[in-house]
Amino acid sequence: TRDVREPPALKYGIVLDAGSSHTSMFIYKWPADKENDTGIVGQHSSCDVPGGGISSYADNPSGASQSLVGCLEQALQDVPKERHAGTPLYLGATAGMRLLNLTNPEASTSVLMAVTHTLTQYPFDFRGARILSGQEEGVFGWVTANYLLENFIKYGWVGRWFRPRKGTLGAMDLGGASTQITFETTSPAEDRASEVQLHLYGQHYRVYTHSFLCYGRDQVLQRLLASALQTHGFHPCWPRGFSTQVLLGDVYQSPCTMAQRPQNFNSSARVSLSGSSDPHLCRDLVSGLFSFSSCPFSRCSFNGVFQPPVAGNFVAFSAFFYTVDFLRTSMGLPVATLQQLEAAAVNVCNQTWAQLQARVPGQRARLADYCAGAMFVQQLLSRGYGFDERAFGGVIFQKKAADTAVGWALGYMLNLTNLIPADPPGLRKGTDFS
């Protein structure tokens, strides 16, 4: 007989990403003896919570907590029983709850309390349910992307850690209710609210980040609908042959459409609205979302928000990925350049409802929204953030890296569990368990 070294025990962590439209649960794992290594934490499993986001339960807070039960029960199975008590569990809510907190703080508190009550019933190490700021959402997304792609530090052949020369990737996240842009910058930000200083593995990072509330895909679509009702009586971004009846109360219930709300409107009135497949009018409608009229800084992205010039490579995820993936995969259109992205948006916007349904058989639920979505992504990147053709060449649209979803959740957990130390790692000897 001979002694056989057992592989090291695994540790686990759980994050509930409570987005504006739905909640996702991510379970992460890492070898217990390599907690401070880079790129060692990976996704173990995930679960999509059925139904809407927790912010949709403003009138029924217990419904929010009840909706999480199925995924929490799955977590009991996915994490070994002996690891339950030592597994941190976090819930982070983003722009949907930020909006609810603006309009109805009591409801927002009630939802978080109901969710907290349910999460404490489970044998995990529950460490709180809270609303993330836009800045946190942006920075943690950036941390996730760069951690997964091992841009912070790497273990070299010579047996020591080094910082890769390639630098860090910028991160762009398009959620349902907000969008975030985050990237490393050399010069100090003119607007201190847009700058975050990070110390990771002994390295100092100056990061620019900004979150635009109401510029998430779903809120943009709602704002465009409000604008179409107001200015056209038809929707230029919807396909010709697509006709809906709209309850006005639904359109103007969001804080993001409040500015467009008519003085005296009947919230229970139904209005018919049809699409017109008009790419040029749609572009104009989307352009109206961005203001370039005033900038109190040396340079701005839009709406008077400071932004240094975009630099380096970027990863664009969540709805950025889904929009571009639809253009590439479902529509078979090239999107390698900004010009191609614009042409693809125009192509989709030219399609009638019948043509779209024929091109993308089966799925009909959100098909009518892809024109506006594509036009918005193209305008946001080119006019909003200032990507030119050269800079756009450095943007990759990605959903996962190293089999792990790209988003703020992993970065959030890494930060709260101190899995990324501020100090540089010492010299270590590796142990081979094979």
Epitope: Q219, Q222, R240, T244, Q245, L247, V251, W353, A365
Partner: antibody
């Protein structure tokens, strides 16, 4: 108030073409809506056949696509169903219905729900020699 | 296509009692946080009538005793306190993907 009324022969011979018409009153079929045909086999559930839109686009159930034609006559505010090469399996109550996409908001996200909220009374068609 | 299976086929309930009808889909009828499930009521000799859309939204003019719930593949229509006029066949219908499909129906009998 939108009203729909089906009409057509109640008896059709096998291998022939079934023809039905739906007359719409209280609303112009070119103004909006999707004008559907649905059938219900004796003692069975409902089966969607297809529609013609306010814009004259068609959408058919793949299981019937090669036998179905839905057309319209805007001057009479009518739309029609033709089902070719019928067999006894096509014996059913045939309904016409007006449908549309209802915009609904949930969880800060709007979406579109296809509903059929105006229906005719139905007409029975028997396929028999 | 998405196959919808309703149960029970027949349900016999006394007035004032609760009636629960189930509809199971062969694949999820949810998309991006929305459930594309509608419920219709069909009384003998009449055309179907829309009761509930988007799984849980009550159509205007429908009594509040009717409610819908569920997501993914499992949906329920509930009548909290059955009235004699509720005797009918109830159908679920999905609109998530083409073609729209209906369940086989549940016949509600009043004792």
């Amino acid at each position: 108030q939108i009203q729909l009324q089906e009409s057509g022969p109640g008896l059709v011979k096998p291998s022939q073409t079934l023809s039905l018409t739906c007359t719409v009153s209280g609303y112009s079929i070119t103004s909006g809506y999707y004008w559907n045909w649905i059938r219900q086999h004796p003692g069975k559930g409902l089966e969607w056949i297809g529609y013609i839109s306010y814009d004259a686009d068609n959408n058919y159930n793949p299981s019937l696509k090669n036998r179905v034609t839905i057309s319209r006559d805007t001057s009479k505010n009518q739309f029609s169903l033709k089902l070719s090469s019928v067999t006894a399996a096509d014996t059913a109550v045939y309904y016409c219905a007006g449908g549309y996409y209802r915009y609904g908001l949930g969880s800060y996200r709007g979406s579109y729900y296809y509903v059929m909220d105006y229906w005719g009374q139905g007409t029975t068609v028997t396929v028999s020699s | 296509e998405t196959v919808l299976t309703q149960s029970p086929a027949t349900l016999s309930v006394s007035p004032g009692e609760r009636a629960t009808i189930s509809c199971k889909a062969s694949q999820s009828v949810d998309y991006e946080g929305h459930s594309y499930m509608n419920w219709y009521q069909q009384k003998p000799g009449q055309a179907p009538r829309l009761l509930i859309y988007a799984a849980s939204n009550l159509e205007s003019g429908i009594p509040a005793r009717f409610s819908g719930s569920g997501s993914g593949t499992d949906f329920t229509l509930t009548i909290s306190s059955v009235e004699p006029e509720d005797a009918a066949t109830y159908y679920c219908q999905q609109s998530n993907e083409d073609p729209p499909t209906f369940g086989g129906g549940t016949k509600l009998e009043i004792k």
